[in-house]
Interface confidence: low
Amino acid sequence: SGVFQLQLQEFINERGVLASGRPCEPGCRTFFRVCLKHFQAVVSPGPCTFGTVSTPVLGTNSFAVRDDSSGGGRNPLQLPFNFTWPGTFSLIIEAWHAPGDDLRPEALPPDALISKIAIQGSLAVGQNWLLDEQTSTLTRLRYSYRVICSDNYYGDNCSRLCKKRNDHFGHYVCQPDGNLSCLPGWTGEYCQQPICLSGCHEQNGYCSKPAECLCRPGWQGRLCNECIPHNGCRHGTCSTPWQCTCDEGWGGLFCDQDLNYCTHHSPCKNGATCSNSGQRSYTCTCRPGYTGVDCELELSECDSNPCRNGGSCKDQEDGYHCLCPPGYYGLHCEHSTLSCADSPCFNGGSCRERNQGANYACECPPNFTGSNCEKKVDRCTSNPCANGGQCLNRGPSRMCRCRPGFTGTYCELHVSDCARNPCAHGGTCHDLENGLMCTCPAGFSGRRCEVRTSIDACASSPCFNRATCYTDLSTDTFVCNCPYGFVGSRCEFPVGLPPSFPW
């Protein structure tokens, strides 16, 4: 589709005569008829196959024709065509005399023709005008012409249709040859594909507008080059989405089980050596002179209550010294000078003679102890609480306050790793020394029976175009990680050529 443009510039008819030689009265009021048609070796009358146009009266006898393109478009004359420009043409230009205002052929005199010219030749599409001058016996016509493409048509033959656009279906202008020239930030055959943020990961990122980087499921970060670990992953990392690879010293499905309490918390004091003994449990080996679960207590030699029979202990630089009560002697007040006659048993204790009265023994009532029943029973002295539990006297009984990870009357039991029902989908839990083991029912596998083997969401290969399939453990659904050039929940649509709708 294009336009053949003809610009009339000057017509000379000095004598003011018709082609027949008859003078026009009062002068030749001149208008033109133009016929454009296919190339003919000899231009002959007949259908104007490429178009025809007529002008109004432009002047009398001799006159210059004004360029009137701005005021109504009469000059240059426009001969539009709706086909591929063939590159050749024939042109007939007739000058007619119109005595009155009616320019219809039947309203003109029978000899109204002033002049008739016919040319033919080759003409390429272009902006440049070709200047020509045709002279007959009595007249001369100067004119120029060219062929240009209509709006939205391009190419050597005006055959390429291109409508510039900037909307959801394309972002481009048209080059002179009709090829698309994408607007900044767009690419692809129809400039529908945005150019993502520089560095945006080809597979894991995409964009819907230029300089954007949107992440596919399982990826994050400004350039979508950081994987998202499994939901709930505490002390772990990933190299592909939904992984949870534990940092050193951590274990469990979510890397939330502390396997290195010693390193992470340094619980042992005063230079003691720490040994990990299971999840969140440890043992401190104290240096000489220290005691306590965490070796936090400095040892005093009197702490072991070496003095018997109510003797009081005094610390000394070189050890300790027992101050014995009346009737007792010896390093630890272990020898008695008393007999039952001296009523040595306190707190209602019964005295029994020994060695023919030379010695005695006290039988103490409940809650009292010592050689003379002088001590209230401290049920914690024997340190009955295991695994670093704290012993508490509660009247006639005692109680162990256990450290985290232990239970039982004497803190002798590890807290069952199975207590929180870690095995999914009805798996059976077994406590082991260093953790637990799940025995999974049919159809499930994994350390915690979390993998549905019989209904693996990826088993049906739902992802197209060689996309990678990931099973989301928490929802038993799949996520497709598309290769470059594809989008969609199953990577089923090419990015460059989505089902088109180019309005």
Epitope: D151, N152, K163, D167, H168, S208, V487, G488, E492, F493, P498, P499, S500, F501, P502, W503
Partner: antibody
Framework: EVQLVESGGGLVKSGGSLRLSCAAS????????MSWVRQAPGKGLEWVAI????????YSADSVKGRFTISRDNSKNTLYLQLNSLRAEDTAVYYC????????????WGQGTMVTVSS | SYELTQPPSVSVSPGQTASITCSAD??????VSWYQQKPGQSPVLVIY???KRPSGIPERFSGSNSGNTATLTISGTQTMDEADYLC?????????FGGGTKLTVL
């Protein structure tokens, strides 16, 4: 056979709601833009809404913005139009139409479903 | 807002050519489609991209579009062509329909 079948129309009071469905068959539904067009009795066609092949782009006429919602379920080959806050002027035959690939025209139309809003 | 203007009615004798226009500012820069709708029936696409015919549409239907006017031409009009004809184009993100032209074949 390529076919679009609308359903869900009926009589509803002003201010009420309806959900129209359009079941597609005979072509790859998930690959094409789809639209709803309505025609009030004795009037011309009025475009209502259009949705992209994957549902990511939706456009609607100003007259229904905020009241009507277009959606689709590609797994069911079904197009939907949720009509809320209905008015008397929404009374029309509602057509479901497929936008032909690569041109501006709607090349397949359903038989239409009548929605009547009484005041 | 962008409006497509059509004459309400056009009459033509059988066998003659009917031309139905659709006008809007710089319409020639846009694609125009034409639909035929008979009473009680759904619309049918007869012309798209200004001048292209879908398969099954007779050759007597043709179209053109330049400047501000698109034209649907039916040459050798038949009585079965009596119907409403609607033009349609696109303005930004909106689909725009003309008001429709009733073609009467006398």
């Amino acid at each position: 056979e390529v076919q679009l079948v609308e359903s869900g129309g009926g009589l509803v009071k002003s201010g009420g709601s309806l959900r129209l469905s359009c079941a597609a068959s005979g072509f790859t539904f998930r690959s094409h833009w789809m639209s709803w067009v309505r025609q009030a009795p004795g009037k011309g066609l009025e475009w209502v809404a259009i949705i992209s092949y994957d549902g990511s782009n939706k456009y609607s006429a100003d007259s229904v913005k905020g009241r009507f919602t277009i959606s689709r379920d590609n797994s069911k080959n079904t197009l939907y139009l949720q009509l809320n806050s209905l008015r008397a002027e929404d009374t029309a035959v509602y057509y479901c139409a497929k936008a032909g690939g690569g041109n501006v025209g709607f090349d397949i139309w359903g038989q239409g479903t009548m929605v009547t809003v009484s005041s | 807002s962008y409006e497509l203007t059509q004459p309400p009615s056009v009459s033509v004798s059988p066998g003659q050519t009917a031309s139905i226009t659709c006008s809007a500012d710089k319409l020639g820069t846009k694609y125009v489609s034409w639909y035929q709708q008979k009473p009680g029936q759904s619309p049918v696409l007869v012309i798209y991209q200004d001048a292209k015919r879908p398969s099954g549409i007779p050759e007597r239907f043709s179209g053109s579009n330049s400047g501000n006017t698109a034209t649907l031409t039916i040459s050798g009009t038949q009585t079965m062509d009596e119907a409403d004809y609607l033009c349609q184009s696109w303005d930004r993100s909106d689909v725009v329909f003309g008001g429709g032209t009733k073609l009467t074949v006398l």
